[in-house]
């Protein structure tokens, strides 16, 4: 089943995207795009990081995890409607056709109107991991909060060892994540 | 307006090296892939290769161990160099644009050269 | 390698009919967002290959809407609604999920 990633009109979005370097330092270039992966790099990139550095990044698009330990995550500030669509994390490990590529559908959703005058907190500070199943039933919010007792590798052996699992799908959708080395 | 074009030999001789040339116009070979697809005498397309805007290559698995492919971006040249060839290489060689989208794969070609590898 | 295999291999038509064209994949060619990388190609007679749909249903740019793909996971299919007497050639189904890509036999369109 397709895992959407959804927000509202005026929020900051959020979609997850992992490795786990091989070594700490040992980063991996990875290219973030507008638009399903392409057979190879990303098309219409709004953001790269190559072994050292964030190297080209646009307005709005920023990596708010640390894309030093492979959490390459994106944030898209102040979304619109027109940010919906699919969106391409691509993993570029060296070596003969290695890459890994995720394709990432995010919904935007018109901003709901509040009677209260209370301030709304950001949305990436609120739910820092948050993403939507589409199961049987109404759709369910998870919020994974910031992982603090599962590293990265955990995650991508329990989504390896689980992957046709809905617990997988959740995992492996909620990071997105692959191991190198 | 885009175009490529191919030029090269049209007959090579067998164990020999095939060494073709790609000339573009109306895009630069830093923002767009190109690459090599081929059609033997009356067969379908095989995909030979491609280079990435950043300069990547990624071979057919077939023929990984024969092929190379370069570009010269200040001559918007690219080209394919086939090692130890046989009659089996005889073909059509396009030469494509990879529109670096989903939707622009392999969406001009050049018109084609007839190579013949033959004694 | 992902091996792609077409039915029929040529097939004749008249003029305004419909044709069909089947396309079936060794491998899903559908990923977890719902995105199939399948694509459909025309070769006409004397000429390159051209492209005609990308991700299975996406009409490439410049085609007729007589065109339409459909399908997902292993299975699709090339509709053309009323044949023309242009689109005479060989089609091509192709997959672009996984390196090396690779394409199905062709299916040669006459018209009769």
């Known amino acids: 089943s397709e895992v959407e990633y959804r927000a509202e009109v005026g929020q900051n979005a959020y979609l997850p995207c992992f490795y786990t370097p091989a070594a700490p330092g040992n980063l991996v270039p990875v290219c973030w795009g507008k638009g399903a992966c392409p057979v190879f790099e990303c098309g219409n990139v709004v953001l790269r990081t190559d072994e050292r550095d964030v190297n080209y990044w646009t307005s709005r698009y920023w990596l708010n995890g640390d894309f030093r330990k492979g959490d390459v995550s994106l944030t898209i500030e102040n979304v619109t409607l027109a940010d919906s669509g699919i969106y391409c994390c691509r993993i570029q490990i060296p070596g003969i056709m290695n890459d890994e590529k995720f394709n990432l559908k995010l919904v935007i959703k018109p901003a709901k109107v509040t009677p209260a005058p209370t301030r709304q907190r950001d949305f990436t500070a609120a739910f820092p991991r948050m993403l939507t199943t589409r199961g049987h039933g109404p759709a369910e919010t998870q919020t994974l909060g910031s992982l603090p007792d599962i590293n990265l590798t955990q995650i991508s052996t329990l989504a390896n060892e689980l992957r046709d699992s809905r617990l997988a799908n959740d995992l492996r959708d909620s990071g997105a994540t692959i191991r190198i080395g | 307006q885009v175009q490529l074009q191919e030029s090269g030999p049209g007959l090579v001789k067998p164990s020999e090296t095939l060494s073709l040339t790609c000339t573009v116009s109306?895009?630069?070979?830093?923002?767009?892939?190109v690459g090599w697809i081929r059609q033997p005498p009356g067969k379908g397309l095989e995909w030979i290769g491609i280079?990435?805007?950043?300069?990547?290559?990624y071979y057919n698995s077939a023929l990984r161990a024969r092929v190379t492919i370069n570009r010269d971006t200040s001559k918007n040249q690219f080209s394919l160099k086939l090692s130890s060839v046989t009659a089996a290489d005889t073909a059509v060689y396009y030469c494509?644009?990879?529109?670096?989208?989903?939707?622009?794969?392999?969406?001009?070609w050049g018109q084609g050269t007839m190579v013949t590898v033959s004694s | 390698d992902i091996v792609m295999t077409q039915t029929p291999l040529s097939l004749s038509v008249t003029p305004g009919q419909p044709a069909s064209i089947s396309c079936r994949s060794s491998q899903s060619l559908s990923d977890s967002a719902g995105i199939t990388y399948l694509y459909w190609y025309l070769q006409k007679p004397g000429q390159s290959p051209q492209l005609l749909i990308y991700l299975a249903s996406n009409l490439g740019s410049g085609v007729p809407d007589r065109f339409s793909g459909s399908g997902s996971g292993t299975d699709f299919t090339l509709k053309i609604s009323r044949v023309e007497a242009e689109d005479v050639g060989v089609y091509y189904c192709m997959q672009g999920i996984h390196v090396p890509l690779t394409f199905g036999q062709g299916t040669k369109l006459e018209i009769k």
């Open positions: 494509t644009r990879d529109g670096t989208t989903v939707e622009t794969l392999f969406d001009y």
């Open positions: 109306g895009f630069s070979l830093t923002n767009y892939g």
């Open positions: 280079m990435t805007s950043g300069g990547s290559t």
